[in-house]
């Protein structure tokens, strides 16, 4: 069964800047990747970026840079300032769509030890 992994990291240089990395562990070729925050797309989440292997990348603030890392993994950097910037307990979700197999999604947030209040 295909799986999706999600990794959330806070940048050491900018404590309110996040990097989200997601990957698809499966045999299908990816048609679309959707990254959202605040929950999955279908459950109140807000889309941050949509990545299509042929037709390019769309992103919305506070997303700063979305890109393909491999054919089955992506990364997204979020801006760290402004009213819409994420906080430490924000949930980020990635949904990988593969045709004709279907879609798989997973969510993640910062590990507790990444809390900026705990860092030196």
């Amino acid at each position: 069964t295909p799986e999706v992994w999600v990794q959330v990291r806070m940048e050491a240089t900018e404590l309110s800047s996040f990097t989200i990395r997601c990957g698809f562990l499966g045999s299908g070729s990816i048609s679309l990747v959707t990254v959202s925050w605040g929950g999955p797309n279908g459950a109140g989440g807000t889309t941050l970026a949509v990545l299509h292997p042929e037709r390019g990348i769309r992103q919305w603030a506070p997303a700063r840079q979305a890109r393909w890392e491999t054919q089955s993994s992506i990364s997204l950097i979020l801006e760290g300032s402004g009213a819409s910037s994420p906080c430490a307990n924000t949930t980020f979700c990635c949904k990988f769509a593969s045709f004709p197999e279907g879609s798989w999604e997973a969510c993640g947030s910062l590990p507790p030890s990444s809390d900026p209040g705990l860092s030196a």
Partner: antibody, heavy 120, light 107 residues
């Protein structure tokens, strides 16, 4: 203007064969996943077969596996369905449809359909 | 396979009525739900994708809602051209499956 035009339907005896064709125009055919959907008289819609844009993956309804073969020729902007060992229960209108990645694989354009009648 | 159970199977209504058609999935289908309209002898037409997004040219009286397993198509004020059969469909997991259809008839 997006257009899908099916052909190749007709009356065939049980055990016989037909080859359906779908001619596509008005869009970059090679970038889209395609499907064949059928509708028996007075019944609902049923996905028969699907093929992704790069011809890596296909799907077949269980009852047509081993009898039907989906293929596409991106150079000719055409989709095909080779139907062998036809049965009475294959009688239906067959539609070709285009899937839009950005719409969650919804079928955004359909052909007018071609009627396949399997009867002795 | 994911089952899509649509209700009601038929519905009589008058021009100007507000109509709601529901679709229940046998398991969560995220937001990968579409609605189609089909008139006799014609191919289906896409109305709604991703649960609530209207396809190009679809009038604003058509709206979709729901999440997870429960979805709704609403026509806010029926027009004569809306009498047709409506199908929901999930595209979350292969095979894509359709509801059995709701036939909307003139009362």
């Amino acid at each position: 203007e997006v257009q899908l035009v099916e052909s190749g339907g007709g009356l065939v005896q049980p055990g016989g064969s037909l080859r359906l064709s779908c001619a596509a125009s008005g869009f970059t055919f090679s970038s889209y996943h395609m499907s064949w959907v059928r509708q028996a008289p007075g019944k609902g819609l049923e996905l028969v077969s699907a093929i992704n844009s790069n011809v890596i993956s296909t799907y077949y309804l269980d009852t047509v596996k081993g009898r039907f073969t989906i293929s596409r020729d991106n150079a000719k902007n055409s989709l095909y369905l080779q139907m062998n060992s036809l049965r009475a229960e294959d009688t239906a209108v067959y539609y070709c449809a285009r899937h839009e990645d950005y719409y969650g694989f919804a079928m955004d354009y359909w052909g007018q359909g071609t009627l396949v009648t399997v009867s002795s | 396979d994911i089952q899509m159970t649509q209700s009601p199977s038929s519905l009589s209504a008058s021009v100007g009525d507000r109509v709601t058609i529901t679709c229940k999935a046998s398991q969560s289908v995220s937001n990968d739900v579409a609605w189609y309209q089909q008139k006799p002898g014609k191919a289906p037409k896409l109305l709604i994708y991703y649960v609530s997004n209207r396809f190009t040219g679809v009038p604003s009286r058509f709206s979709g809602s729901g999440s997870g397993t429960d979805f709704t198509l609403t026509i806010s004020s029926l027009q004569p051209e809306d009498f047709a059969t409506y199908f929901c469909q999930q595209a979350y997991r292969s095979p894509w499956t359709f509801g059995q259809g709701t036939k909307l008839e003139i009362k």
